[in-house]
Interface confidence: medium
C-alpha cells in the first residue's frame, strides 16, 4: 500500500487536501521525497475508485496512517523521506 517514487522531474501536486482519507478506500500511497525538480515532499493517494488525491504531508492523520501502514508492511515497503526542502 505504501511505496516510494523517486523519478519525478517536477511537482505533481498543484494543491493538497488536509481532510482525512479513510484507510478502507485507499488502494496505494506514494511518498515522493524532495528533489529531482520538485522542492517539496508530495504524498499522493490512489483510492479504490481510481481517484488520485494529493495530501498535505504535514497532516497529523497522515502520520498516523503512515505508522499504521508501516507496522503492517515493515519489511516489504520502500521508504521515502517525508520532508520539506528548504527554500533556495
Amino acid at each position: 500500500i505504501l511505496e516510494a517514487h523517486y523519478t519525478n522531474l517536477k511537482c505533481r501536486c498543484s494543491g493538497v487536501i488536509s481532510t482525512v482519507v479513510g484507510l478502507n478506500i485507499i488502494d496505494r500511497i506514494q511518498v515522493t521525497p524532495p528533489g529531482n525538480g520538485c522542492p517539496k515532499t508530495e504524498v499522493v493517494i490512489w483510492t479504490k475508485m481510481k481517484k488520485v488525491i494529493c495530501v498535505n504531508p504535514r497532516a497529523k492523520w497522515l502520520q498516523r496512517l503512515l505508522r499504521h501502514v508501516q507496522s503492517k508492511s515493515l519489511s516489504s515497503t520502500p521508504q521515502a523521506p517525508v520532508s520539506k526542502r528548504r527554500a533556495a
Epitope: 523517486y6 502520520q63 505508522r67 519489511s75 523521506p81 520532508s83
Partner: antibody, heavy 120, light 107 residues
C-alpha cells in the same frame, strides 16, 4: 538483524580522494535509504546526504555538494561515499546509517564510523 | 537551514536521578524530532523518533515529548550505561540538522 558495516580507517594526502563503503544486511536493501553523517573530533554531527537505493536517488546537503558523491551496488548491498579534493577540514569520522523514513526522518541503525585523517 | 539548539552542553546527575535534556529548533518542525545517544566509544544509537516514539530495544526509562519548536528527552531512572552524549535531530526540512549535543556525566 539489521546491520550496517563500514570500511576501515583511512590516512590520505591533501588534494586526494577517498572512497569508503557501508555494507548492509538483515533487510531488503532496495527498500531503504542510507544516510551519511560527518563528525569532526570533539564536535557535533552534520548530515551529508542520503541515497535511495531503488532508483539511485540522491540528495545532498549544499555544503557537501562537489565534495561527497554517493553511489550504491545492489549486488553486494553496499553504499559508497567518495570524498574529493581532501583538506584538513575533511579529517573526521564519517558514519553511515539506515534511513527510517516512514515518519520522523530518523536514522535507525548506525555503524561505528570510518575515520578519515588528511595529512601530508 | 533550521538551527537546533541544545542549551545545556554538559549535565551532571546521580544514578537513579530523573534527567531532562532540552532541544529547541529555530522554526516549527512538526514533531519531526529524533534523539540519539553517542557513547564514549563513539557508538551512536537511535533512542526516540518522531518526538516520542521509542525505537526498538531502547529501555522504557527513555521518553520524549514536545511540539512546535521545543522538545525534550527524559531519562527517568539514570543508570551507569546512560553516560553518553545526547543529540537531537530535525527531519522536517532539508538539510536535516543536529543539535550540538548534551554530555551527561555522573556526579
Amino acid at each position: 538483524e539489521v546491520q550496517v558495516q563500514q570500511s576501515g580507517a583511512e590516512l590520505v594526502r591533501p588534494g586526494s580522494s577517498v572512497k569508503m563503503s557501508c555494507k548492509t544486511s538483515g533487510y531488503t536493501f532496495t527498500n531503504y535509504g542510507i544516510i551519511w553523517v560527518k563528525q569532526r573530533p570533539g564536535q557535533g554531527l552534520e548530515w551529508i546526504g542520503y541515497i535511495y537505493i531503488g532508483k539511485g536517488y540522491t540528495e545532498y546537503n549544499e555544503k557537501f555538494k562537489g565534495k561527497a558523491t554517493l553511489t550504491s551496488d545492489t549486488s553486494s548491498s553496499t553504499v559508497y561515499m567518495q570524498l574529493s579534493s581532501l583538506t584538513s577540514e575533511d579529517s573526521a569520522i564519517y558514519f553511515c546509517a539506515r534511513g527510517a523514513h516512514y515518519y520522523g526522518n530518523a536514522m535507525d541503525y548506525w555503524d561505528q564510523g570510518t575515520s578519515v585523517t588528511v595529512s601530508s | 537551514d533550521i538551527q537546533m539548539t541544545q542549551t545545556t552542553s554538559s549535565l551532571s546527575a546521580s544514578l537513579g536521578d530523573r534527567v531532562t535534556i532540552s532541544c529547541r529548533s529555530s522554526q516549527d518542525i512538526s514533531n519531526f524530532l529524533n534523539w540519539y545517544q553517542q557513547r564514549p566509544d563513539g557508538t551512536v544509537k537511535l533512542l526516540i523518533y518522531y518526538t516520542s516514539r521509542l525505537h526498538s530495544g531502547v529501555p522504557s526509562r527513555f521518553s520524549g515529548s514536545g511540539s512546535g519548536t521545543d522538545y525534550s528527552l527524559t531519562i527517568s531512572n539514570l543508570e551507569q550505561e546512560d553516560i553518553a552524549t545526547y543529540f537531537c535531530q530535525q527531519g522536517d526540512t532539508l538539510p536535516w540538522t543536529f543539535g550540538g549535543g548534551t554530555k551527561l556525566e555522573i556526579k
